[in-house]
Structure formats: structure tokens, C-alpha cells
């Protein structure tokens, strides 16, 4: 038989037990609060630095693009792709149709002031997208030229000129003096490319990479 404890001893044991429980609770709370602080501070710092980076990136573009239209890329809330607000987007690029009539060189300079180039068309899909925004009774400069007049066509961004991925109208190019390319509509062939004089004012299409923030 277990001897009965003295009341004094019982109180002492109870007090010791309570102390252990309380100290465990306090330690647990401390640990939890540390964990909570760490878990909120780390992402907060991460988010803060990402925001700072975004702001500085946006500031870069703000001089010629005061507003951007951004969409979430994939499922990650932190990755956005943007195009300047009046521009349209397709795949990884942004496009702008310039309705001012200018020479090829001036058109390219204007695109470059906006951080872009005259459009380089790499695929049929890209051309199909672009023509949705064009007017049939207009012609638009492309970023394609032959400054030497020797039929050595070159893209403004140095993309290699691939004869297999060209969309010239039939019979074009047809004049060594016509050293710049436009895209225009012909009722017989729909949309295609034509060579014209570079100094003749035309509308134009600018293209730039999407801005990722």
C-alpha cells in the first residue's frame, strides 16, 4: 500500500507539476511565435525585394510607356508579363501599329525610341496574328531591308533571313531599287510582302519582347 502523502508534500508536487506545464506552454508559445515571425518575415522580405525590383523595372519603361497592361503568367501569382497599354500581345512579344506615315529609317528609329524594332516575322502564326489588326487599304513597313540592293535581305534584329519562312506576294521582290519590305493586302493573294522604296512614307509595325516583372 502506498503511504498517503502529507498535505505539504502534495502542494509541493502540484506546484512543481504546474510549473512544468506552464514552462512547457511558454516555451511552446515562444517557439511558435519565433516560427511565425520567421515564416512571415522571410516571405515579407522576399516579397519586399521583389516589389522593389518590379518598381525599378517599371521605372525603366515609364519614360516611353507610362502604363502597362499585365497578365499573370502560369499559376505563379508572382510572375507577370506586360505590354505597353495600347500594344497587343502574342506569345512572348508585344506589337504596335503605327498609323503615322514615315520613311523606313524614320519608322525604325521611332520603334527604337519605344524600346522596340520594326516587326520581324518568324512564323505564319505570327503573321496571321499581326494581320488581324491591319487595314486592307494600307501598307506597313516590316523590319526587313536590303540596303545594298543585292538581294541580301536582313532583319533589323539580326535574325537570319530564312527564304523558307517568307511571305512575299508572287513576283516579289522585283526591283533592286526597292530595298525595304512592306506587308500589304492584294485581293488575289490576301496578305503578303512587297519590296518598295525605303524613302516612301508608309505606316509601320513595331515589335518588342514582353516585359516580365
Amino acid at each position: 500500500m502506498v503511504p498517503e502523502e502529507e498535505p505539504q508534500d502534495r502542494e509541493k508536487g502540484l506546484w512543481w507539476f504546474q510549473l512544468k506545464v506552464w514552462s512547457m506552454a511558454v516555451v511552446s508559445i515562444l517557439l511558435l511565435s519565433v516560427c511565425f515571425t520567421v515564416s512571415s518575415v522571410v516571405p515579407h522580405n522576399f516579397m519586399y525585394s521583389k516589389t522593389v525590383k518590379r518598381l525599378s523595372k517599371l521605372r525603366e519603361y515609364q519614360q516611353y510607356h507610362p502604363s502597362l497592361t499585365c497578365v499573370m503568367e502560369g499559376k505563379d501569382i508572382e510572375d507577370w508579363s506586360c505590354c505597353p497599354t495600347p500594344w497587343t500581345s502574342f506569345q512572348s512579344s508585344c506589337y504596335f501599329i503605327s498609323t503615322g506615315m514615315q520613311s523606313w529609317t524614320k519608322s525604325q528609329k521611332n520603334c527604337s525610341v519605344m524600346g522596340a524594332d520594326l516587326v520581324v516575322i518568324n512564323t505564319r502564326e505570327e503573321q496571321d496574328f499581326i494581320i488581324q489588326n491591319l487595314k486592307r487599304n494600307s501598307s506597313y513597313f516590316l523590319g526587313l531591308s536590303d540596303p545594298g540592293g543585292r538581294r541580301h535581305w536582313q532583319w533589323v534584329d539580326q535574325t537570319p533571313y530564312n527564304e523558307n519562312v517568307t511571305f512575299w506576294h508572287s513576283g516579289e521582290p522585283n526591283n533592286l531599287d526597292e530595298r525595304c519590305a512592306i506587308i500589304n493586302f492584294r485581293s488575289s493573294e490576301e496578305w503578303g510582302w512587297n519590296d518598295i522604296h525605303c524613302h516612301v512614307p508608309q505606316k509601320s509595325i513595331c515589335k518588342m519582347k514582353k516585359i516580365y516583372i
Epitope: 523606313w104 524614320k106 540596303p147 526591283n175 531599287d177 530595298r179 522604296h197 524613302h199
Partner: antibody, heavy 121, light 111 residues
Framework: EVQLVESGGGLVKPGGSLRLSCAAS????????MSWVRQAPGKGLEWVAT????????YYPDSVKGRFTISRDNAKNSLYLQMNSLRAEDTAVYYC??????????????WGQGTTVTVSS | DIVLTQSPASLAVSPGQRATITCRAS??????????MHWYQQKPGQPPKLLIY???NLESGVPARFSGSGSGTDFTLTINPVEANDAANYYC?????????FGGGTKVEIK
């Protein structure tokens, strides 16, 4: 030898018409863009009209747009300038000039001797 | 339109001396290293004659006394040394875009 010979100039009353011609020889006329450039008495040079080699493109300054028409006949090696609704300020020597393309632009490498147009009542 | 301003309007030079004519464009006439400014000489009663194309290229048959330089908006025609038969009007012309425009001309007189 490249030669450009203008003709058709003369005295005409304001509101009248005149047709200038330029006969080209010594080069493959159909392969070159051509222009008309004029020079008023004691003044500088002023471009008046351009036509591309393939006849696909014509261009004029605002001062003559709607009044002057440039054309060519490659079979006859000839360039023309039809001038209607003539004004006193159109008085000038009119030169026919051949364009030679260089990079994204061009220059005038051969000029005719010019033909004089006087618009006066 | 691109406006070309020539200076001086006239100058008198002694034979054997250097003559320098400048042409300033209201905007750049250069693109990727190509300068679309050209120079012509016109003697009284004659048509203009091409001297220099694309800023610095001497036209065939033109004496090496003539030279051109410049880029962007500022271009120079130099005659060195000047000879008596260089008395003429000199014009610059740009062709980077339509309309092609000419400078107002510089009259070179020989002392």
C-alpha cells in the same frame, strides 16, 4: 554616254498648261527612277516630282500636288511632266534628273540641260 | 520635311586656299552608318553636277580636291586647294526620306 534632253518649255499664261518631255539615252532607262527638279530665276533647287523605275510610285511636293503629273514611257525612253493650272511661281528652269539608289536613299547622278518655263500674262 | 540650312550663303576664297561649306539638317539624315547627304556643284548657265554622294564618297571624275564629311545633322564640303574654275554655287541634298530637299546654296567666288 548618259544623256538627258528636256524639251517643251515656253511662255504660258497663268492657268494654262504645258507638257515637258525628257529624252534619255546611253543607259537602260527602264531600270532607273527619274525626277524633275526646278530652279526659279536666281533661286535654289526645288524637287518637283519623282517616278519609280517600274512606274509603281509617283510622288510630289504639296506645292504642285494635284496640278502636275509625272509619267514615263519606257519603250520610248522618255519622261514627261504634265503641268496644269500654272501659276507665276512655277516660272523656272525645269531639269530632268536620273536617280541612283544608295542604301536607303538616292542621289541625282545625271541632269539634263534644262528647259525654261515662263508663266506670265 | 527635312530642312537643310547651308552656311555661309557666300564666300570669297583665294586660289590655293581652303573653302569650307557646311550643311545642317533639321533632323538626322544618317542611319546605321550610312549618311544620306549629297553635294552638287552648279556653274552659271549649267545644270547641277554631282560631286559627293553619301556624305564622303567622291563621284567618278571629280577631282580629289573636293571632299565631304559629317554625320547625323552636320555635314561639310571642303575644297582644298581652291582653283579658279571652282567658282560656282554648291548645294547639299538629303534623300533619307521624301520629299528630297536641297539646301539654299552657297556661292563660292574666287578672289
Amino acid at each position: 554616254e548618259v544623256q538627258l534632253v528636256e524639251s517643251g518649255g515656253g511662255l504660258v499664261k497663268p492657268g494654262g498648261s504645258l507638257r515637258l518631255s525628257c529624252a534619255a539615252s546611253g543607259f537602260t532607262f527602264s531600270s532607273y527612277g527619274m525626277s524633275w527638279v526646278r530652279q526659279a530665276p536666281g533661286k535654289g533647287l526645288e524637287w518637283v516630282a519623282t517616278i519609280s523605275s517600274g512606274d509603281s510610285y509617283t510622288y510630289y511636293p504639296d506645292s504642285v500636288k494635284g496640278r502636275f503629273t509625272i509619267s514615263r514611257d519606257n519603250a520610248k525612253n522618255s519622261l514627261y511632266l504634265q503641268m496644269n493650272s500654272l501659276r507665276a511661281e512655277d516660272t523656272a528652269v525645269y531639269y530632268c534628273a536620273r536617280q541612283l539608289y544608295y542604301s536607303y536613299g538616292y542621289y541625282f547622278d545625271y541632269w539634263g540641260q534644262g528647259t525654261t518655263v515662263t508663266v506670265s500674262s | 520635311d527635312i530642312v537643310l540650312t547651308q552656311s555661309p550663303a557666300s564666300l570669297a576664297v583665294s586660289p590655293g586656299q581652303r573653302a569650307t561649306i557646311t550643311c545642317r539638317a533639321s533632323e538626322s539624315v544618317s542611319f546605321h552608318g550610312t549618311h544620306l547627304m549629297h553635294w552638287y556643284q552648279q556653274k552659271p548657265g549649267q545644270p547641277p553636277k554631282l560631286l559627293i554622294y553619301a556624305a564622303s564618297n567622291l563621284e567618278s571624275g571629280v577631282p580629289a580636291r573636293f571632299s565631304g564629311s559629317g554625320s547625323g545633322t552636320d555635314f561639310t564640303l571642303t575644297i582644298n586647294p581652291v582653283e579658279a574654275n571652282d567658282a560656282a554655287n554648291y548645294y547639299c541634298q538629303q534623300s533619307i526620306e521624301d520629299p528630297p530637299t536641297f539646301g539654299g546654296g552657297t556661292k563660292v567666288e574666287i578672289k
